[in-house]
């Protein structure tokens, strides 16, 4: 007669997290009397998963009624599978005794759990950088299995190549994490740009997960400054304009200095956006030439996004404008950003 065989027909079984896993096991004989037990792993540290004889195993149910006469099917179903359930499961026949004696083990069935990666989280640099500088973006996704995964970076739809990606741990694990860093060279046109981290995995059925970051959070576009003088008005007043253009973000403070002394400070707010996402701002200053004996040095000082101030100066030539007697009275304030100098 043939001796007892414990048959586990599948070498491996792959199950999606949250589903049930069926682990098949049949025996070739009902002799000798004694229980079947299921273990995860082998050796002294193995973990008891199910014992027909005794115990309470809420997530494990026998596929066939184990109390049925002539039952030789000791397959089990494990519900609500998580990555922690991955491993090799052994169906083991014991011979009745005190204690029961292990008689024969099946060859084992490796349970692998297909777990979806978490939504990729993209984080950018802690501080802003200007055009021509390189900034790093990091993308992280966790909890996936199996280990094989693909991660791609895109900037405005174009794949990035300066990328470094690691999947951890390197060895076998119940689940894995991916971390990738992309280096992006900024341009002045990147205020509206976006980087996308795209993760593809077998569990996603061809529908990759994406995480995004806006370069507007990472970029600083410093302003251009231009100070100009409009033509002399009939009332001996000169209109001086400071044009601050193509800057981002909007956080900007403008200070007018007259011969080195602070004349007025303004904060930019509610500015209209340019097509490229940058901002422009114009500030005017009315200078009453007749109130000055000497030339006036006007300075437009701009502090942008907490950076060191940028200055642009302009000299109003008083000698070029003959004074009118009694003209040292205040001129009218004719615009929001206009102020008279005495």
């Amino acid at each position: 007669e043939e001796e007892l065989q414990v048959i586990q027909p599948e070498k491996s079984v792959s199950v999606a997290a949250g589903d049930s896993a069926t682990l098949n096991c049949t025996v070739s004989s009902l002799i000798p009397v004694g229980p079947i037990q299921w273990f995860r792993g082998a050796g002294p540290g193995r973990e008891l998963i199910y014992n027909l004889k005794e115990g309470h195993f809420p997530r494990v149910t026998p596929v066939s009624d184990p109390t049925k006469r002539n039952n030789m099917d000791f397959s089990i179903r494990i519900s609500n599978i998580t990555p922690a359930d991955a491993g090799t499961y052994y169906c083991v026949k014991f011979r009745k005794g005190s204690p029961d004696v292990e008689l024969k083990s099946g060859a084992g069935t490796e349970l692998s759990v297909r777990a979806k990666p978490s939504a990729p989280v993209v984080s950018g640099p802690a501080v802003r950088a200007t055009a021509e500088h390189t900034v790093s973006f990091t993308c992280e996704s966790h909890g996936f299995s199996p280990r094989d995964i693909t991660l791609k970076w895109f900037k405005n739809g174009n794949e990035l190549s300066d990328v470094q990606t690691n999947v951890d741990p390197a060895g076998k694990s119940v689940s894995y994490s991916i971390r990738s860093t992309a280096r992006v060279v900024l341009t002045r046109r990147d205020v509206h740009s976006q980087v996308i981290c795209e993760v593809a995995h077998v569990t996603l059925q061809g529908d990759p997960l994406r995480g995004t970051a806006n370069l507007s959070e990472a970029i600083r576009v410093p302003p251009f400054l231009e100070v100009t003088q409009q033509s002399m008005r009939a009332d001996n007043q000169v209109n001086v304009t400071c044009q601050v253009t193509k800057f981002y973000p909007q956080r900007l403070q403008l200070t007018w200095l007259e011969n080195g002394n602070v004349s007025r400070t303004e904060m930019a707010s509610a500015l209209p956006e340019n097509k490229d996402g940058t901002y422009n701002w114009t500030s005017w200053l009315l200078v009453n030439v007749s109130a000055h004996r000497d030339d006036v040095k006007l300075t437009c000082q701009v502090e942008h996004d907490g950076q060191p101030a940028v200055n642009k100066s302009f000299s109003v030539k008083v000698s070029a404008h003959p004074k009118e007697q009694g003209s040292n009275t205040a001129a009218e304030n004719t615009g929001t950003n206009e102020r008279n100098i005495y």
Epitope: L30, I31, V33, K53, T67, M72
Partner: antibody
Framework: RQLVESGGGLVQPGGSLRLSCTAS????????ISWVRQAPGKGLEYIGT?????ITYFASWAKGRFTGSKTSSTAYMELSSLRSEDTAVYFC????????????WGQGTLVTVSS | AIQMTQSPSSLSASVGDRVTITCQAS????????LAWYQQKPGKAPKLLIY???TLATGVPSRFSGSGSGTDFTLTISSLQPEDFATYYC???????????FGGGTKVEIK
Amino acid sequence: RQLVESGGGLVQPGGSLRLSCTASGFSLSSHGISWVRQAPGKGLEYIGTIGTGVITYFASWAKGRFTGSKTSSTAYMELSSLRSEDTAVYFCARGSAWNDPFDPWGQGTLVTVSS
Amino acid sequence: AIQMTQSPSSLSASVGDRVTITCQASQSVYGNNDLAWYQQKPGKAPKLLIYLASTLATGVPSRFSGSGSGTDFTLTISSLQPEDFATYYCLGGGDDEADNVFGGGTKVEIK
């Protein structure tokens, strides 16, 4: 699906006998065959179970005197050094207890030990 | 070795009666459930009724039920029928595979 015993009869004290249990309608290869006896007017008494070669076991009182073997269709039990108190109807049944209970049973064969 | 004590050894009952037979083991049976019940009529082989303490064998009427665990077990016939008059045996299994012992039997007779 049934079991049929044979081989019973009259035997002298100290003698031997070989009982057979033949299955029809099913194979014995994956099942144990257990033997139970019943002395006249008494209750049932478990003797032992015949499995494969090494998986054959007998109640402590029957060890040494009773042995067994099995093919895919027939189980045998050898009775030796018979005594008058071994007089009984001998039943065979498929199964080895616990989750493999004794079912079905043969009709029984009478063994009489007398001089 | 395990010992099985069955009670009562005999009882008289009428058709329709509820009948309870008990079986006590000298130690916990194997797996707390290695207990079977058999019915035997005169001149016939025993017939399996219940195994694993409470599992009804195929073809056995549902008026038969088994309960218990460890050392104390019960066979109940909810409504005795004329064909139920017979002798009932429990069979308990100890931890050793050859340690299978029948109780002394309970003869159910017509009152």
